[in-house]
């Protein structure tokens, strides 16, 4: 009931945009800037001075960044007692990009809304917003979480249910951006297992694999461009790298999607009525990985059953030699442990500076692909010559 | 495979991709609450962080959260 | 503080009609979607109808489409419910609700409509 | 429309007894859901939201849980304010509707 007492502004400084514009350029990322949308004139339009500020500074520097307005702004009302409603957030949209193409930012790139998940009057809010403003983003940003940390329980994670809700929720994005504005690239702007931090002794846990392998294979399949995880590193228990800078199971498993998982999204299915607890993925391979080459397939599935599996490759790949990149939980707290094995080897860091090999398993052609119970696995399905991927 | 073994056969459809998602399809965030951590120069200076940071490259670094909305820049703070 | 006070109920015959209002206070009333909510003597409860922040959008349950009416006025922080051809199964106990996506946090105390005749 | 199941129907425990009561959605609804407590004469008050977040000012003795289509509302002690009927309502679409109500009586 009105808890928009619960936050209050703080400021940041030049040295801080230093540190974080200077920490994504040294590690090969490109740098998104969430500016603060609850500045407002007495007449609820957005205003741009603080922004302004900000871009001149970013400007003198010669960043390169992209930007967002605003986050989760259906929520305004329960975090602030404001409401905006999408027409006017479209209006201050518009605002941003002039500025931005008043500056030495004339091609930066402009992201948004970030709603949370298309509830009914949050798919409302994106609608009016993407016919407001819909024009002047590059992308379409949207959050989504599984879960609420505070309650959420192992069987959760390991619940084919849940990880099913998310469809429904990419669908109605999608019903909302083809009726505003069709075409219009869709990404997660924000998203992780449970909300509220994550959940205490499972969001950085083995188990909370599945939620994420099923969410980009989900993501990939449905038509969403870019996924970005909730958090790379910070407080909470969803992070990827925790605050001893050690990597967690969920940073090994984006480790290996990155180096192992291409751009072109084709399409894996279980042949039956089971398939909820086995979920299969298929791409063309990351060509940028040395050990392929154009024309294979990378396949990525996850078993939810509690025996093992043996998935049976179809015509004309059956007889192709395959290399098996399984993930299984190390040590006595099993799907809750914070190690992870590949191929039975345990992932660390070798020292600050290098990140171990990940070392496939040829298997030998011919042979099923064997996934033990609660586990997932990347099979990369070599010489596969696969004509959309080349 | 033996004939007591749990076998699923898959079906692929590879004629022509589904989708072509970003080749930075898989990013990650910094929750801009960091930003207001003590720390927050130190931690993001940190050799290790970068190096696994750089693992992931290409790909986005989104700084939000619900701290973006109360976050005001000070070019004077020091 | 938020009050939400409904007003307007009482005994009416079968085919005959009502308006409720509900006064509200505390809160921004323009930010907030509004809902009515009614409960029949005894039984559960049963949404009727919500409407947008700015009136444009209204939504009501099947039984009383055509008959009922949701409308507001912001400037006088005022939720209405006009109800025509009023029958005997709607007579309740009803409610006026502050509505979130998530939960309706605030309800009067409600207002009864007997029909009768 | 979504029509909402509560179990069981009514209920009597005893203070410091803990009570589970769920409510089953003909369909997925995410986690749309919201508990309310209704004491006689009274209007309904909002305890859980979003099937799992407790109101601000609501006893933490109370939770919920759940997601898609089976929810559960958990008085962990029940104390003696807490008899009372308890209903689960849904807002992922609508028509919104609520289950028909669980009545917590004293044994």
């Known amino acids: 009931a009105d808890p928009g007492k619960k936050f209050k502004n703080s400021t940041y400084s030049r040295s801080s945009v230093d540190v974080l514009y200077t920490f994504a350029n040294c590690s090969g990322l490109d740098l998104i800037f969430g500016l603060n949308a609850l500045l407002r004139t007495a007449d609820l339009q957005w205003n741009s001075s603080n922004a302004q500020l900000l871009l001149d500074y970013c400007s003198s520097k010669g960043y390169n960044i992209s930007w967002e307005l605003g986050n989760e702004p259906n929520s305004f009302l329960k975090k602030a007692d404001i409401f905006i409603n999408g027409s006017q957030l479209g209006e201050d949209f518009i605002q941003l990009h002039k500025l931005l193409r008043k500056s030495t930012f004339k091609n930066a790139k402009l992201y948004g809304p970030d709603v949370g998940q298309p509830r009914r009057k949050t798919a409302k809010m994106l609608k009016s917003f993407l016919k407001a403003g819909g024009e002047v983003i590059d992308s379409v940003t949207w959050h989504h979480y599984y879960l609420n940390g505070r309650t959420a329980t192992k069987e959760d994670f390991l619940n084919p249910d849940v990880l099913d809700i998310f469809i429904s929720s990419v669908q109605k994005v999608f019903q909302v951006v083809e009726s505003t504005r069709p075409g219009k690239k869709v990404w997660l702007g924000e998203t992780s297992s449970a909300y509220g931090g994550g959940a205490p002794l499972l969001s950085d846990t083995f188990a909370a694999g599945f939620m994420w392998l099923d969410k980009l294979g989900l993501s990939a399949r449905m038509g969403i461009e870019v996924v970005m995880r909730q958090v790379f590193f910070g407080a909470g228990n969803y992070h990827l790298v925790d605050e001893n800078f050690d990597p967690l199971p969920d940073y090994w498993l984006s480790l290996l999607f990155k180096k192992l998982v291409g751009t072109k999204v084709l399409m894996a299915s279980v042949q039956g009525s089971k398939r909820r607890k086995l979920r299969v993925y298929l791409h063309c391979t990351n060509t940028d990985n040395p050990r392929y080459k154009e024309g294979d397939l990378t396949l990525y599935a996850i078993n939810l059953h509690n025996v093992t599996k043996y998935l049976r490759l179809p015509y004309p790949f059956s007889n192709k030699q395959v290399d098996k990149y399984l993930l299984r939980p190390l040590g006595p707290h099993g799907l809750l442990s914070k190690s992870v094995q590949l191929n039975g080897l345990t992932l660390k860091m070798v020292d600050d500076q290098t990140l171990p090999p990940l070392m496939e398993k040829p298997l030998r052609p011919g042979s099923s692909l064997g996934l033990p119970a609660f586990s997932y696995s990347f099979f990369v399905i070599r010489n596969a010559k696969v004509a959309a991927c080349i | 495979a033996d004939p007591g073994q749990d076998v699923v056969d898959l079906d692929f459809f590879t004629q022509e991709p589904l989708h072509l998602v970003s080749p930075s399809f898989l990013s990650v965030t910094i929750d801009a609450n960091l930003a207001t951590d003590p720390r927050f120069l130190i931690l993001l200076g940190s050799p290790k962080l970068r190096t696994l940071a750089r693992g992931l490259s290409p790909a986005y670094l989104r700084f939000g959260g619900t701290k973006t909305d109360f976050l005001i820049f000070d070019p004077k703070k020091e | 503080e938020v009050q939400l006070v409904e007003s307007g109920g009482g005994l009416v015959q079968p085919g005959g009609s009502l308006r409720l209002s509900c006064a509200a206070s505390?809160?921004?009333?323009?930010?907030?979607?509004m809902s009515w909510v009614r409960q029949a003597p005894g039984k559960g409860l049963e949404w009727v109808a919500s409407?947008?922040?700015?009136?444009?959008?209204?939504y009501y349950v099947d039984s009383v489409k055509g008959r009922f009416t949701i409308s507001r006025d912001n400037a006088k922080n005022s939720l209405y419910l006009q109800m025509n051809s009023l029958r005997a199964e709607d007579t309740a106990v009803y409610y006026c609700a502050r509505e979130l996506d998530w939960g309706w946090d605030y309800w009067g105390q409600g207002t009864l409509v007997t029909v009768s005749s | 429309a979504i029509q909402l199941t509560q179990s069981p129907s009514s209920l009597s425990a005893s203070v410091g007894d803990r009570v589970t009561i769920t409510c089953r959605a003909s369909?997925?609804?995410?986690?749309?859901l919201a508990w309310y407590q209704q004491k006689p004469g009274k209007a309904p008050k909002l305890l859980i939201y979003?099937?799992?977040s407790l109101e601000s000012g609501v006893p933490s003795r109370f939770s919920g849980s759940g997601s898609g289509t089976d929810f559960t509302l958990t008085i962990s002690s029940l104390q003696p304010e807490d008899f009372a009927t308890y209903y689960c309502q849904q807002f992922n679409s609508y028509p919104i509707t609520f289950g028909q109500g669980t009545r917590l009586e004293i044994k």
């Open positions: 979003d099937a799992s």
């Open positions: 505390g809160f921004t009333f323009s930010s907030y979607w």
């Open positions: 369909q997925g609804i995410s986690s749309a």
């Open positions: 409407i947008y922040q700015d009136g444009s959008e209204k």
